[in-house]
Structures are given as C-alpha cells and as structure tokens.
C-alpha cells in the first residue's frame, strides 16, 4: 500500500509531498528534507521525520526505575543523516565537524568528538520507557482499563503489535508504558518501537504527524486522559559510552 489514492495524500505523514507519478499513475509520497519515498501505510522512520522537521519553516513503586544506562534525549533537535532505508546512521556530525554516535532512535550515546570519531554499528534501542503524568481527575483510572486503552491505541493508531507493549504501569498520576522489541523479535513489516514512541510523543505534545486527522483524543472509559508531562527513557542493547566527566 502507498498513499491514499483518492486525494493523493499520505495518511501517516503530513511532512510529505505527494503526486500521482508512481507506477501506473499511483500516488507516491516523498518525505520533505530527504526526498525519500515513504510507505504511507505505516509509520515513517523517526530519522526521516526529524530531517523533514528540520527542513520545514521554523514557525511551522510499581513504577519502573530507569536503569543507570537509560538515555534521555537531552540534545533535542538536529538535522540527522539517514541511510537509504531511512534509519539513523550510527555517526552523526554537525556543520562544525563535531560528531557523535547515536542509537536506533537517534539519541546520542557517546561523548561528542571530531571527524575521527568511529561508530562501528548502529546500536539498537530495545526498551523504551514512556513516563507520563496526567492531569488531576475525579478519581484514579482503572489500571486494566488504562492498560487496554493504551494497547489498543498503539495497535490501531501506531500499528504496533501489542506483544511489543511489555507493560503499562500506573501509580496515580504517573503512567509508564514499557515498549520492548529485541532484534530477533522484529519481523519484516513490524513497526519499530522507536518510531511508535516518537509518533506518540508528538501526538501527546499536540504536534500530530498524521495527515488531516484530529489530534489525539485519549479517553479511558469516556474519561479524558490529559497528559501534562512526558519523559522518555531509551535503553540500548549495548550500554552507552560516556566519559565520567559527563556523569558528575
């Protein structure tokens, strides 16, 4: 499947340019910034989305304790280098020849260096912890209802099989969604947990990446779930390599 044929748009990525110039006059969409063709029946990779974002006009207790190796995306936005499949290249550099290694979700996992820095492989992020705080409600949400709704959301909106939603933890007002996906588990066609988490993050922030769809209206048994804070932790298959200097 490619883009929506009727009006030639990309339902899963509004940061695209679409035209009916594919084989047999089919609608084909290309990501802004990279010009790469995207599959509009699934989520676009985070690397291509970040690249498109950077090219766009600028105005446009039961809880889990993240491990010592968990990464938080403190560096924010940058214009990434993506490989031909749309994945992050292991080494990223800026215009001033400062380079660093990233994981599969594009988060820096080493100290910054110069052009001599080597990043041998793209290390996979296999565990993502999405930490949410919801606005006060009349009462706590029912845990199993919350679990069911979030799993449904990730399946139906982000196309992530529920087997990759390892757990949903809840201690009012904190909700934690654990996404896990080992290399061996991920089959061809499976959405990457990093991409699902990025789409979810943007939805929560009211910056939906979907074409022409209303923003995310999260409800648990009809009760609105409004998020006031989001923190995302990334755990890689190989722990990150930072100098002690960074940790003090």
């Amino acid at each position: 499947h490619t883009a929506a044929q009727d009006n030639c748009t990309c339902p899963t990525n509004k940061m695209t340019v679409c035209s009916p110039d594919g084989p047999g006059g089919r609608c084909q969409c290309r990501a802004l910034g990279s010009g790469m063709a995207v599959d509009c029946s699934t989520l676009t990779s985070k690397c291509l989305l970040l690249k498109a974002r950077m090219s766009a006009p600028k105005n446009a207790r039961t809880l889990v304790r993240p491990s010592e190796h968990a990464l938080v995306d403190n560096d924010g936005l940058y214009d990434p280098d993506c490989d031909p499949e749309g994945r992050f290249k292991a080494r990223q550099c800026n215009q001033t020849s400062v380079c660093w290694c990233v994981n599969s979700v594009g988060v820096r996992r080493t100290d910054k260096g110069d052009l001599s820095l080597r990043c041998d492989e793209l290390v996979r992020t296999h565990h993502i912890l999405i930490d949410l705080r919801h606005r006060p409600t009349a009462g706590a949400f029912n845990h199993s209802d919350l679990d069911a709704e979030l799993r449904r959301l990730f399946r139906e909106r982000y196309r992530l099989h529920p087997k990759f939603v390892a757990a949903v933890h809840y201690e009012q007002p904190t909700i934690q969604i654990e996404l896990r996906q080992n290399t061996s588990q991920k089959a061809a066609g499976d959405v990457d947990i990093g991409d699902a988490a990025y789409y979810f993050e943007r939805d929560i922030k009211g910056e939906s990446l979907f074409q022409g769809r209303g923003g995310l209206d999260l409800r648990v048994r009809g009760e609105p779930l409004q998020v006031e804070r989001t923190l995302i932790y990334y755990l890689d298959e190989i722990p990150p390599k930072f100098s002690m200097k960074r940790l003090t």
Epitope: S41, D147, A148, R151, R157, K163, R180
Partner: antibody, heavy 119, light 111 residues
Framework: QVQLVQSGAEVKKPGASVKVSCKAS????????INWVRQAPGQGLEWMGV????????SYNQKFKGRVTMTRDTSTSTVYMELSSLRSEDTAVYYC????????????WGQGTLVTVSS | DIQMTQSPSSLSASVGDRVTITCRVS??????????MHWYQQKPGKAPKLLIY???NLESGVPSRFSGSGSGTDFTFTISSLQPEDIATYYC?????????FGGGTKLEIK
C-alpha cells in the same frame, strides 16, 4: 451495545466472486480493526485476514493472498470481504470479528454468512 | 505458521465434573509475560464467543467456572463444574503472530 451484523447467505458458481458485508454499531468504528474468520462445514476456524478500519488497509493470510480483498466504508461503518475465483472448498460460514482492546483477541463476532459454492 | 495442537478432540463428561482441555503451541506465544492465547466457545449454528483472553483473563460476563492457565507453549482451559449449557466446541487461538491460528477444537458432550 456492540453489534456486528453480516449480510445474508449466498450461493455462487465455481470461478465466481462473493462479497460479504459486516456492519458495525455500538462503538466508534475506526477504533477497532476487523478480522475475517471462516469455518467449513463440520470443520474448525480459519483466520483469513484483518483490516484496519482506521487506515483502510489489510493484512491477509498468505493462503488467501491474491483471492481476498478487504475494504471498509467509514461513512456506513461497514467492512467488506470479497473472495474471488471461488471453488467448492470455499463453501463455509464466514464471520467478521472485532479485535478486543489489548491482546488481539476477538471480542465480538458477527452472526456469520453461509457461502455455498456449487455448480 | 504457528501450529496449535488441541486435545482431546472430543470428550464426554457428566454435569458437575471438572473438565480440562489442553492446547500446545509449536512456538512460544509469550511476550514479556503476556501470553497471546485465547479460548472460545462455539455452540452449534452460532458464532464463537470469547471466554478467556491472554491465557488466563476471564472475559467480562463469562461465568467464573471457566478458567485458563499456562504460558509459553502449554496452555490449559478448565471448566470447574460442568453445566448442561456448556455443551459446545471449544477452541484455543494464538494472536502472537500472523497468520493467527486456531486449535482443531474440542467437542464437549454430556454423558
């Protein structure tokens, strides 16, 4: 309450096509994907595929690839399953079934549509 | 494809009996402690009805005499005290991997 109502029984000749409908009500149609399962007389259940009511695309059991097409009409909250190049072995009751919330279980089923393929 | 071996294919029991059906899967359907195994009841001429989801969770409105257990590749479905209305065919199903597959069914009869 959630309901899936299917179209009536069909009798078809070998080589023909059949299109079965499944009308959903009692919930937000685009919130849940719809599966199709068939059951030949006196036999077990066989999963044919699933359609995303949100996106409109489908994933099919390889066994039926090229012969089955699943579509949806959000304006009428209806899902369709079309099976082509019918043969006698396709004689079965065809069910639509909604995904449940969290674990891809099928929580609501249509009443079934008997499709008879006979010359 | 994941193969499902359900046994027995048929069984006869008396009202009040404890009935057990097993389902063995060709590969694990466990993902981080979540088992993508479900059980359905089908009465003659009717659509299947979900009884148990995620191996051991009772679907809303289903009597508590029905239960499920197991993980990985071996699963069990139990009726603690058989009732006349339980006469039906029971199926296990995995939704871990596409194509989703069902067990061959167990036809339950009253002695």
């Amino acid at each position: 309450q959630v309901q899936l109502v299917q179209s009536g029984a069909e009798v078809k000749k070998p080589g023909a096509s059949v299109k079965v409908s499944c009308k959903a009500s009692g919930y937000t149609f685009t919130d849940y994907s719809i599966n199709w399962v068939r059951q030949a007389p006196g036999q077990g259940l066989e999963w044919m595929g699933v359609i995303s009511t949100y996106y409109g695309d489908a994933s099919y059991n390889q066994k039926f690839k090229g012969r089955v097409t699943m579509t949806r009409d959000t304006s009428t909250s209806t899902v369709y399953m079309e099976l082509s190049s019918l043969r006698s072995e396709d004689t079965a009751v065809y069910y639509c079934a909604r995904y449940g919330d969290g674990y891809n279980q099928f929580d609501y089923w249509g009443q079934g549509t008997l499709v008879t393929v006979s010359s | 494809d994941i193969q499902m071996t359900q046994s027995p294919s048929s069984l006869s029991a008396s009202v009040g009996d404890r009935v057990t059906i097993t389902c063995r899967v060709s590969e694990s359907v466990d993902s981080y402690g979540n088992n993508f195994m479900h059980w359905y009841q089908q009465k003659p001429g009717k659509a299947p009805k979900l009884l148990i989801y995620r191996a051991s969770n009772l679907e809303s409105g289903v009597p508590s005499r029905f239960s499920g257990s197991g993980s990985g590749t071996d699963f069990t479905f139990t009726i603690s005290s058989l009732q006349p209305e339980d006469i039906a065919t029971y199926y296990c199903q995995q939704s871990y991997e596409d194509p989703y597959t069902f067990g061959g069914g167990t036809k339950l009869e009253i002695k």
